[in-house]
């Protein structure tokens, strides 16, 4: 798409991990769980131990973008959340280490993190009009908005 090719020459350099072991809950208070190995989905949990714990790494853009650009990794793994296309599930991509530099087609690993009060939004850098979203009876995917849920609460320090 046009936005993707426009951004593809921007280089993103890894800075540091800024959050460890947090849980993402959607607006229906469903937690993200790992389903069937490479997929994520949302479910109302009795036991929060079933919720995925994420780490968040920050990247700095060569374009000096004001937006906070992040990568999402499942804690204690080498699995990174990877965007596909609109309404397609996000996938878990295994990489030996966190990428030091990301550019071009690899920007599907990156998200712009925006906060509005307690609401958190993750926009795909590769598809800037699409958000990480939950959808009833479906996987965590990329979506532009309703009926998918695009706002998340970050739960930290869950024992």
């Amino acid at each position: 798409s046009a936005p993707f090719s426009f951004l593809s020459n921007v280089k993103y350099n890894f800075m540091r991990i800024i959050k460890y072991e947090f849980i993402l809950n959607d607006a229906l208070n469903q937690s993200i769980i790992r389903a069937n190995d490479q997929y994520l989905t949302a479910a109302a949990l009795h036991n929060l131990d079933e919720a995925v714990k994420f780490d968040m790494g920050a990247y700095k853009s060569s374009k000096d973008d004001a937006k906070i650009t992040v990568i999402l990794r499942i804690s204690k793994t080498q699995l990174y959340v990877t965007a596909q296309d609109e309404d397609q599930p996000v996938l878990l991509k295994e990489m030996p280490e966190i990428p030091k530099t990301i550019t071009g087609s690899e920007t599907n690993l990156l998200f712009f993190w925006e906060t509005h009060g307690t609401k958190n939004y993750f926009t795909s850098v590769a598809h800037p009009n699409l958000f990480i979203a939950t959808k009833q009876d479906y996987w965590v995917c990329l979506a532009g908005g309703p009926p998918s849920i695009t706002d998340f609460q970050i739960l930290e320090n869950q024992a």
Partner: antibody, heavy 122, light 107 residues
């Protein structure tokens, strides 16, 4: 209540085939992978294969490639294991077990079927 | 593949005893260690996941600990109904191997 209910015991002759079913209830079938585990008489647990219940893709442990086939019927939340060209050494209890990731990083098998005994004898 | 070595292979203890079983992984498994109980002629049951978390409905006399490559399963006060074989299993990387099992008997 989460339950995995397997089909009943089977007695087969060498060279025959057997198909074991595992019907799941009490949870969203496609959200959790399914495992098949073998326990031969007096032996330890061996994880034979695991199935992505969304895509139907099976991943086999090295010792179980060839004569084993694992299938799904998502409309009835049922997993199947088929074993062809049966041999006496296939005599064992076969379990299905739901796979779950704790924290997204640690895999366990939290609910198990009651087991299906397959006896191969001439 | 990660290998799991469980010890002892069998043990005999009296009712009320504290019982300990160990499991060693061939490499660091980051606390991704589960324990299962299998009573004679029955299906395995998940007792403990992620080193120390009790699965729902499991009595508190069962516990787990450890880190890195070395893990321990403990029954604080052995009960007659605890007669079973206990298996560890690593949940870090495929193929998520089981240990060889420890058969627990009452003296």
């Amino acid at each position: 209540e989460i339950q995995l209910v397997q089909s009943g015991a089977e007695v087969k002759k060498p060279g025959a085939s057997v198909k074991v079913s595992c019907k799941a209830s009490g949870y969203t079938f496609t959200n959790y992978g399914m495992n098949w585990v073998r326990q031969a008489p007096g032996q330890d647990l061996e994880r034979m294969a695991w199935i992505n219940t969304y895509t139907g893709e099976s991943t086999y442990a090295d010792d179980f490639k060839g004569r084993f086939t694992f299938t799904l019927d998502t409309s009835t939340s049922t997993a199947y294991m088929e074993l062809s060209s049966l041999r006496s050494e296939d005599t064992a209890v076969y379990f299905c077990a739901r796979g779950i990731y704790y924290y997204g990083s640690s895999y366990a098998m939290d609910y198990w079927g009651q087991g299906t005994t397959v006896t191969v004898s001439s | 593949d990660i290998q799991m070595t469980q010890s002892p292979s069998s043990l005999s203890a009296s009712v009320g005893d504290r019982v300990t079983i160990t499991c060693r992984a061939s490499q660091d498994i980051s606390n991704c260690l589960n324990w299962y109980q299998q009573k004679p002629g029955k299906t395995p049951k998940l007792l403990i996941y992620y080193t120390s978390r009790l699965h729902s409905g499991v009595p508190s006399r069962f516990s787990g600990s450890g880190s890195g490559t070395d893990y321990t399963f403990t029954i604080s006060s052995l009960q007659p109904e605890d007669i079973a074989t206990y298996f560890c299993q690593q949940g870090k990387t495929l193929p998520y191997a089981f240990g060889q099992g420890t058969k627990l008997e009452i003296k």
